[in-house]
Protein backbone atom coordinates (compact mmCIF):
# COMPACT_ATOMS: atom_id res chain seq x y z
CA UNK A 1 0.00 0.00 0.00
CA UNK A 2 1.10 3.57 -0.58
CA UNK A 3 2.13 5.92 2.15
CA UNK A 4 -0.73 7.57 3.98
CA UNK A 5 -0.83 11.13 5.24
CA UNK A 6 -1.31 11.60 8.93
CA UNK A 7 -3.41 14.48 10.15
CA UNK A 8 -1.56 15.44 13.29
CA UNK A 9 -3.38 18.04 15.36
CA UNK A 10 -1.59 17.73 18.66
CA UNK A 11 0.19 20.64 20.27
CA UNK A 12 3.93 20.44 19.93
CA UNK A 13 6.64 21.64 22.25
CA UNK A 14 7.93 25.18 21.79
CA UNK A 15 11.30 23.99 20.55
CA UNK A 16 9.78 21.68 17.97
CA UNK A 17 10.50 23.03 14.52
CA UNK A 18 10.40 19.74 12.63
CA UNK A 19 7.37 19.74 10.33
CA UNK A 20 4.76 17.18 11.16
CA UNK A 21 2.83 15.53 8.34
CA UNK A 22 -0.30 17.40 7.38
CA UNK A 23 -3.05 16.59 4.95
CA UNK A 24 -3.12 17.74 1.33
CA UNK A 25 -4.56 21.20 1.93
CA UNK A 26 -2.49 21.99 5.00
CA UNK A 27 1.07 22.70 6.03
CA UNK A 28 2.89 22.85 9.35
CA UNK A 29 3.12 26.27 10.94
CA UNK A 30 5.97 26.29 13.48
CA UNK A 31 4.62 29.48 15.03
CA UNK A 32 1.45 27.80 16.28
CA UNK A 33 2.93 24.27 16.26
CA UNK A 34 0.02 22.86 14.27
CA UNK A 35 -1.11 21.95 10.81
CA UNK A 36 -3.07 24.85 9.35
CA UNK A 37 -4.85 25.60 6.10
CA UNK A 38 -2.28 26.47 3.49
CA UNK A 39 -2.50 28.16 0.12
CA UNK A 40 -0.42 27.12 -2.84
CA UNK A 41 2.93 28.84 -2.89
CA UNK A 42 2.77 31.71 -5.37
CA UNK A 43 5.32 32.35 -8.06
CA UNK A 44 6.11 35.71 -9.69
CA UNK A 45 3.62 35.22 -12.53
CA UNK A 46 0.78 34.92 -10.03
CA UNK A 47 1.46 38.19 -8.32
CA UNK A 48 4.33 37.36 -6.00
CA UNK A 49 7.95 38.15 -6.72
CA UNK A 50 11.13 37.15 -5.01
CA UNK A 51 14.83 36.87 -5.46
CA UNK A 52 14.45 33.30 -4.25
CA UNK A 53 13.22 30.50 -6.45
CA UNK A 54 10.05 28.96 -5.02
CA UNK A 55 11.01 25.72 -6.70
CA UNK A 56 8.70 22.80 -6.13
CA UNK A 57 7.16 24.06 -2.92
CA UNK A 58 3.59 23.71 -4.11
CA UNK A 59 2.49 20.75 -2.03
CA UNK A 60 3.63 19.04 1.17
CA UNK A 61 6.16 16.27 0.79
CA UNK A 62 4.62 12.82 0.72
CA UNK A 63 4.91 10.92 3.95
CA UNK A 64 7.12 7.86 3.91
Amino acid sequence: MGARRLRVRSQRSRDSSVPTQCNQTECFDPLVRNCVSCELFHTPDTGHTSSLEPGTALQPQEGS
Epitope: P19, C27, D29, L31, N34, E39
Partner: antibody, heavy 125, light 107 residues
Amino acid sequence: EVQLVESGGGLVQPGGSLRLSCAASGFSIRSISIHWVRQAPGKGLEWVAWITPFNGTTDYADSVKGRFTISADTSKNTAYLQMNSLRAEDTAVYYCARRVCYNRLGVCAGGMDYWGQGTLVTVSS
Amino acid sequence: DIQMTQSPSSLSASVGDRVTITCRASQDVSTAVAWYQQKPGKAPKLLIYSASFLYSGVPSRFSGSGSGTDFTLTISSLQPEDFATYYCQQSLITPPTFGQGTKVEIK
Protein backbone atom coordinates in the same frame (compact mmCIF):
# COMPACT_ATOMS: atom_id res chain seq x y z
CA GLU B 1 -14.38 40.07 0.50
CA VAL B 2 -12.15 39.18 3.43
CA GLN B 3 -12.82 41.37 6.43
CA LEU B 4 -12.11 41.48 10.16
CA VAL B 5 -14.11 43.81 12.38
CA GLU B 6 -13.23 44.40 16.02
CA SER B 7 -15.59 45.69 18.66
CA GLY B 8 -15.83 45.95 22.43
CA GLY B 9 -13.22 48.56 23.21
CA GLY B 10 -13.80 51.48 25.53
CA LEU B 11 -12.85 53.16 28.78
CA VAL B 12 -12.42 50.93 31.81
CA GLN B 13 -11.02 51.46 35.28
CA PRO B 14 -7.85 49.68 36.46
CA GLY B 15 -8.74 46.20 37.61
CA GLY B 16 -11.75 46.10 35.34
CA SER B 17 -12.62 43.80 32.46
CA LEU B 18 -13.48 44.06 28.76
CA ARG B 19 -14.28 41.53 26.08
CA LEU B 20 -13.17 42.30 22.55
CA SER B 21 -14.73 40.60 19.53
CA CYS B 22 -13.26 40.02 16.10
CA ALA B 23 -15.89 39.09 13.52
CA ALA B 24 -14.50 37.51 10.36
CA SER B 25 -16.20 37.42 6.99
CA GLY B 26 -15.15 36.20 3.56
CA PHE B 27 -13.21 33.24 4.98
CA SER B 28 -13.46 30.63 7.71
CA ILE B 29 -11.38 31.05 10.84
CA ARG B 30 -11.59 27.31 11.53
CA SER B 31 -8.37 26.10 9.93
CA ILE B 32 -6.02 29.04 10.42
CA SER B 33 -4.63 31.06 13.31
CA ILE B 34 -6.11 34.32 14.55
CA HIS B 35 -3.93 36.80 16.43
CA TRP B 36 -4.45 39.83 18.62
CA VAL B 37 -1.83 42.57 18.34
CA ARG B 38 -1.87 45.82 20.25
CA GLN B 39 -0.30 49.23 19.86
CA ALA B 40 0.03 51.65 22.76
CA PRO B 41 -0.30 55.34 21.85
CA GLY B 42 2.79 56.45 19.94
CA LYS B 43 4.44 53.05 20.34
CA GLY B 44 5.18 50.00 18.22
CA LEU B 45 3.31 46.76 17.62
CA GLU B 46 3.10 44.12 20.34
CA TRP B 47 1.71 40.65 19.79
CA VAL B 48 -0.78 39.64 22.49
CA ALA B 49 -2.19 36.18 21.78
CA TRP B 50 -3.09 33.62 19.13
CA ILE B 51 -5.60 30.83 18.76
CA THR B 52 -6.04 27.98 16.32
CA PRO B 53 -9.84 27.70 16.43
CA PHE B 54 -10.06 24.12 15.10
CA ASN B 55 -8.54 22.73 18.28
CA GLY B 56 -8.53 25.64 20.70
CA THR B 57 -4.75 25.79 21.06
CA THR B 58 -3.70 29.18 22.43
CA ASP B 59 -0.63 31.10 23.49
CA TYR B 60 -0.05 34.47 25.11
CA ALA B 61 2.52 37.19 25.59
CA ASP B 62 4.06 37.06 29.06
CA SER B 63 2.70 40.55 29.75
CA VAL B 64 -0.93 39.32 29.57
CA LYS B 65 -0.64 35.69 30.63
CA GLY B 66 -3.11 34.82 33.36
CA ARG B 67 -5.15 37.98 32.76
CA PHE B 68 -6.25 37.67 29.12
CA THR B 69 -8.04 34.76 27.48
CA ILE B 70 -8.38 34.27 23.74
CA SER B 71 -11.21 32.13 22.41
CA ALA B 72 -13.17 31.52 19.24
CA ASP B 73 -16.62 30.47 18.15
CA THR B 74 -16.33 28.86 14.73
CA SER B 75 -20.10 28.79 14.29
CA LYS B 76 -20.08 32.58 14.52
CA ASN B 77 -16.73 32.90 12.73
CA THR B 78 -15.63 35.18 15.54
CA ALA B 79 -12.63 35.36 17.86
CA TYR B 80 -12.64 36.99 21.28
CA LEU B 81 -10.20 38.48 23.73
CA GLN B 82 -11.37 38.51 27.33
CA MET B 83 -9.28 41.01 29.26
CA ASN B 84 -9.37 40.92 33.06
CA SER B 85 -7.39 42.75 35.75
CA LEU B 86 -6.69 45.54 33.31
CA ARG B 87 -3.80 47.90 33.96
CA ALA B 88 -2.92 51.35 32.69
CA GLU B 89 -0.19 49.78 30.54
CA ASP B 90 -2.83 47.78 28.66
CA THR B 91 -4.10 51.01 27.10
CA ALA B 92 -3.73 50.54 23.37
CA VAL B 93 -5.45 50.03 20.06
CA TYR B 94 -6.15 46.31 19.76
CA TYR B 95 -6.11 44.68 16.34
CA CYS B 96 -7.11 41.20 15.35
CA ALA B 97 -5.36 39.69 12.35
CA ARG B 98 -5.36 36.43 10.47
CA ARG B 99 -2.15 34.63 9.57
CA VAL B 100 -1.96 33.47 5.98
CA CYS B 101 0.20 30.48 5.15
CA TYR B 102 1.72 29.54 1.81
CA ASN B 103 2.99 26.01 1.45
CA ARG B 104 6.76 25.80 1.11
CA LEU B 105 7.78 22.15 1.23
CA GLY B 106 5.09 21.41 3.77
CA VAL B 107 5.95 24.35 6.01
CA CYS B 108 4.07 27.63 6.40
CA ALA B 109 5.59 30.71 4.82
CA GLY B 110 3.38 33.62 5.69
CA GLY B 111 2.40 36.67 7.63
CA MET B 112 -0.59 38.55 8.97
CA ASP B 113 -2.35 39.54 5.79
CA TYR B 114 -5.71 40.88 6.94
CA TRP B 115 -6.18 43.11 9.96
CA GLY B 116 -9.19 44.68 11.56
CA GLN B 117 -9.58 48.42 11.87
CA GLY B 118 -8.59 48.34 15.53
CA THR B 119 -10.50 49.08 18.72
CA LEU B 120 -9.21 51.43 21.41
CA VAL B 121 -8.98 50.22 24.98
CA THR B 122 -8.30 52.91 27.57
CA VAL B 123 -7.55 51.88 31.15
CA SER B 124 -7.80 54.88 33.42
CA SER B 125 -9.38 55.97 36.66
CA ASP C 1 12.04 35.49 23.36
CA ILE C 2 13.62 36.45 20.06
CA GLN C 3 14.46 40.15 19.87
CA MET C 4 14.11 41.94 16.53
CA THR C 5 16.25 45.07 16.29
CA GLN C 6 15.49 47.48 13.46
CA SER C 7 17.71 50.24 12.18
CA PRO C 8 17.49 53.07 11.72
CA SER C 9 14.63 54.05 14.01
CA SER C 10 13.81 56.89 11.63
CA LEU C 11 15.11 58.29 8.37
CA SER C 12 14.43 61.23 6.10
CA ALA C 13 14.34 60.65 2.37
CA SER C 14 13.09 62.22 -0.83
CA VAL C 15 10.76 60.89 -3.49
CA GLY C 16 12.80 58.71 -5.84
CA ASP C 17 15.38 57.76 -3.23
CA ARG C 18 16.42 54.20 -2.60
CA VAL C 19 15.68 53.32 1.02
CA THR C 20 17.04 50.38 2.99
CA ILE C 21 15.84 49.26 6.41
CA THR C 22 17.56 46.48 8.30
CA CYS C 23 16.35 44.08 10.96
CA ARG C 24 18.52 41.82 13.08
CA ALA C 25 17.18 38.83 15.00
CA SER C 26 18.76 37.79 18.30
CA GLN C 27 18.86 34.20 17.05
CA ASP C 28 18.48 32.32 13.79
CA VAL C 29 14.93 32.61 12.45
CA SER C 30 15.64 31.04 9.04
CA THR C 31 13.52 33.06 6.59
CA ALA C 32 10.51 33.41 8.89
CA VAL C 33 10.38 37.20 8.70
CA ALA C 34 7.62 39.47 7.46
CA TRP C 35 7.61 43.20 6.83
CA TYR C 36 4.66 45.53 7.41
CA GLN C 37 3.83 49.11 6.52
CA GLN C 38 1.70 51.22 8.84
CA LYS C 39 0.32 54.69 8.37
CA PRO C 40 -1.02 56.84 11.25
CA GLY C 41 -4.41 55.70 12.48
CA LYS C 42 -4.44 52.66 10.20
CA ALA C 43 -3.83 48.96 10.64
CA PRO C 44 -0.52 47.51 9.43
CA LYS C 45 -0.31 46.10 5.90
CA LEU C 46 1.69 43.02 4.94
CA LEU C 47 4.40 43.80 2.39
CA ILE C 48 6.83 40.88 2.45
CA TYR C 49 6.58 37.37 3.88
CA SER C 50 9.14 34.63 4.26
CA ALA C 51 11.89 37.29 4.12
CA SER C 52 11.74 37.88 0.38
CA PHE C 53 8.34 37.17 -1.09
CA LEU C 54 6.20 40.07 -2.14
CA TYR C 55 2.64 39.87 -0.90
CA SER C 56 -0.14 40.11 -3.47
CA GLY C 57 -0.85 43.63 -4.67
CA VAL C 58 2.30 45.16 -3.18
CA PRO C 59 4.27 47.29 -5.67
CA SER C 60 7.44 45.70 -7.01
CA ARG C 61 9.56 48.62 -5.75
CA PHE C 62 9.43 46.83 -2.38
CA SER C 63 11.78 43.91 -1.90
CA GLY C 64 13.11 41.87 0.97
CA SER C 65 16.18 39.77 1.51
CA GLY C 66 18.07 37.91 4.18
CA SER C 67 18.06 34.71 6.20
CA GLY C 68 19.29 33.61 9.56
CA THR C 69 19.65 36.76 11.62
CA ASP C 70 20.02 39.63 9.15
CA PHE C 71 17.18 40.95 7.02
CA THR C 72 16.64 43.93 4.75
CA LEU C 73 13.64 45.75 3.33
CA THR C 74 14.41 47.90 0.30
CA ILE C 75 12.26 50.47 -1.45
CA SER C 76 13.92 50.98 -4.81
CA SER C 77 12.35 54.33 -5.62
CA LEU C 78 10.45 56.00 -2.80
CA GLN C 79 6.97 57.24 -3.69
CA PRO C 80 4.85 59.82 -1.82
CA GLU C 81 2.55 57.08 -0.50
CA ASP C 82 5.52 55.20 1.01
CA PHE C 83 6.06 57.65 3.85
CA ALA C 84 5.03 55.51 6.80
CA THR C 85 6.41 53.35 9.60
CA TYR C 86 7.80 49.92 8.73
CA TYR C 87 8.01 46.91 11.05
CA CYS C 88 9.75 43.56 10.75
CA GLN C 89 8.37 40.53 12.55
CA GLN C 90 9.70 37.04 13.13
CA SER C 91 7.17 34.23 13.01
CA LEU C 92 9.30 31.17 13.63
CA ILE C 93 8.75 30.86 17.36
CA THR C 94 6.03 32.10 19.71
CA PRO C 95 5.94 34.86 20.77
CA PRO C 96 6.06 36.38 17.28
CA THR C 97 8.08 39.51 17.95
CA PHE C 98 8.16 42.80 16.07
CA GLY C 99 10.97 45.22 15.54
CA GLN C 100 10.54 48.65 17.14
CA GLY C 101 9.71 50.23 13.79
CA THR C 102 11.38 52.56 11.29
CA LYS C 103 9.65 55.82 10.48
CA VAL C 104 10.29 57.02 6.94
CA GLU C 105 9.78 60.77 6.76
CA ILE C 106 9.91 63.35 4.00
CA LYS C 107 13.23 65.17 3.75
